[in-house]
């Protein structure tokens, strides 16, 4: 009976999310393997988040709007492990917008989700950021490593969206 009611609840939750995401990929987790964590297909998952790499070339503002329509934001990178996971799926000859910007050019960098910008957990390439005219951040591959660079916001780039996992 308990299992039946949990299944019914799950199905109704799945139906609720189906109007936003036609397909979800779920895995069982938790100490009793009773919780399901899901990401929209074909998003990838890492820890408690889902990631989507958009190959559509758009400005920073349009990239953020594009993520927003999918219930996500441009990616906020919190740890080196998270960055290493993300970069596994990136192409080394491309650049991707992050959810990091400095809209007033005061070198007050801010994350789209209001996560505090911590200078100790940043992965700027050497010498970056280097221009107050360049107010948006990308991640790209340079000098044999992935790192961040400041660029003009209106120049179209690929982008990475991030959302919290859906738990059912």
């Amino acid at each position: 009976n308990f299992m039946y009611s949990k299944t019914v609840k799950r199905l109704s939750k799945l139906q609720e999310y189906q109007q936003y995401y036609p397909s979800l990929t779920c895995v069982m987790e938790g100490k009793d393997m009773e919780d399901w964590s899901c990401c929209p297909t074909p998003w990838t998952s890492f820890q408690s988040s889902c990631y989507f790499i958009s190959t559509v070339m758009q400005s920073w503002t349009k990239s953020q709007n594009n993520c927003s329509v999918m219930g996500a934001d441009l990616v906020v990178i919190n740890t080196k492990e998270e960055q290493d996971f993300i970069t596994q799926n990136l192409k080394i000859n491309s650049a991707y917008f992050l959810g990091l910007s400095d809209p007033k050019g005061w070198r007050h960098w801010q994350w789209v989700d209001q996560t505090p910008y911590n200078k100790n957990v940043t992965f700027w390439h050497s010498g970056e950021p280097n221009s107050p005219d360049e107010r948006c951040a990308i991640i790209n591959f340079r000098s044999e490593e992935w790192g961040w660079n400041d660029v003009h916001c209106h120049v179209p780039q690929k982008s990475i969206c991030k959302m919290k996992k859906i738990y059912i």
């Epitope: 503002t61 948006c136 209106h154």
Partner: antibody, heavy 121, light 111 residues
Framework: EVQLLESGGGLVQPGGSLRLSCAAS????????MSWVRQAPGKGLEWVST????????YYPDSVKGRFTISRDNSKNTLYLQMNSLRAEDTAVYYC??????????????WGQGTTVTVSS | DIVLTQSPDSLAVSLGERATINCKAS??????????VNWYQQKPGQPPKLLIY???NLESGIPDRFSGSGSGTDFTLTISSLQAEDVAVYYC?????????FGGGTKVEIK
């Protein structure tokens, strides 16, 4: 007072090359992103290229990509536009302009008087 | 590319009267409360001159008879009381996304 003085325009045959210069004064050139914009005779304005202050990022529309190269020499306060494989449709007055950011966008706030490029056989 | 369509192509207005120029973008050029549309004035034989940035902000040194409004895809430049020195071609431009694009221009003349 901001001054931008373009030079290097002239008559060139289709397929030929030309190098435009823009001498800047009255502001700290090395800290400014710079752009080129052109205007065909009797027509509207078309953005041609942009270069960031350090010269390491350059941007072009598809119409000139692969043919035009923007560069700068901050020690000489000069902006350049190298134009190769010129076509009749590149005939225009070429303006250099200073770029000023506005949040996530920008404006072109100071413009030179322009230099005329004519591509004709 | 974002296409900007200006209307009318030309406009004849009496001195002291209001002139209104429209600019329509093929997609929204707004983000987070700002609109990325600028207006320029070009007099014969001269380079363009910045009048309005961010849809409604008057550039320093520009007379306050010029004003800009609008958001999303629809923008307007208004000259509240046309002066003889305002005879020119006016262009809108978007800087939301490369390639930057300009409207086709509106020629303002005195009636």
């Amino acid at each position: 007072e901001v001054q931008l003085l373009e030079s290097g325009g002239g008559l060139v045959q289709p397929g030929g090359s030309l190098r435009l210069s823009c001498a800047a004064s009255g502001f700290t050139f090395s800290t400014y992103t710079m752009s080129w914009v052109r205007q065909a005779p009797g027509k509207g304005l078309e953005w041609v290229s942009t270069i960031n202050s350090g010269g390491d990022n350059t941007y072009y529309p598809d119409s000139v990509k692969g043919r035009f190269t923007i560069s700068r020499d901050n020690s000489k306060n000069t902006l350049y536009l190298q134009m190769n494989s010129l076509r009749a449709e590149d005939t225009a007055v070429y303006y250099c302009a200073t770029y000023r950011p506005y949040y996530y966008g920008s404006v072109l706030d100071y413009w030179g008087q322009g230099t005329t490029v004519t591509v004709s056989s | 590319d974002i296409v900007l369509t200006q209307s009318p192509d030309s406009l004849a207005v009496s001195l002291g009267e209001r002139a209104t120029i429209n600019c329509k973008a093929s997609q929204s050029v707004d983000y987070d409360g700002n609109s990325y549309v600028n207006w320029y004035q070009q007099k014969p034989g001269q380079p363009p001159k910045l009048l309005i940035y961010g849809a409604s902000n008057l550039e320093s040194g520009i007379p306050d008879r010029f004003s800009g409004s609008g958001s999303g895809t629809d923008f307007t430049l208004t000259i509240s009381s046309l002066q003889a020195e305002d005879v020119a071609v006016y262009y809108c431009q978007q800087s939301d996304e490369d390639p930057w694009t300009f409207g086709g221009g509106t020629k303002v003349e005195i009636k």
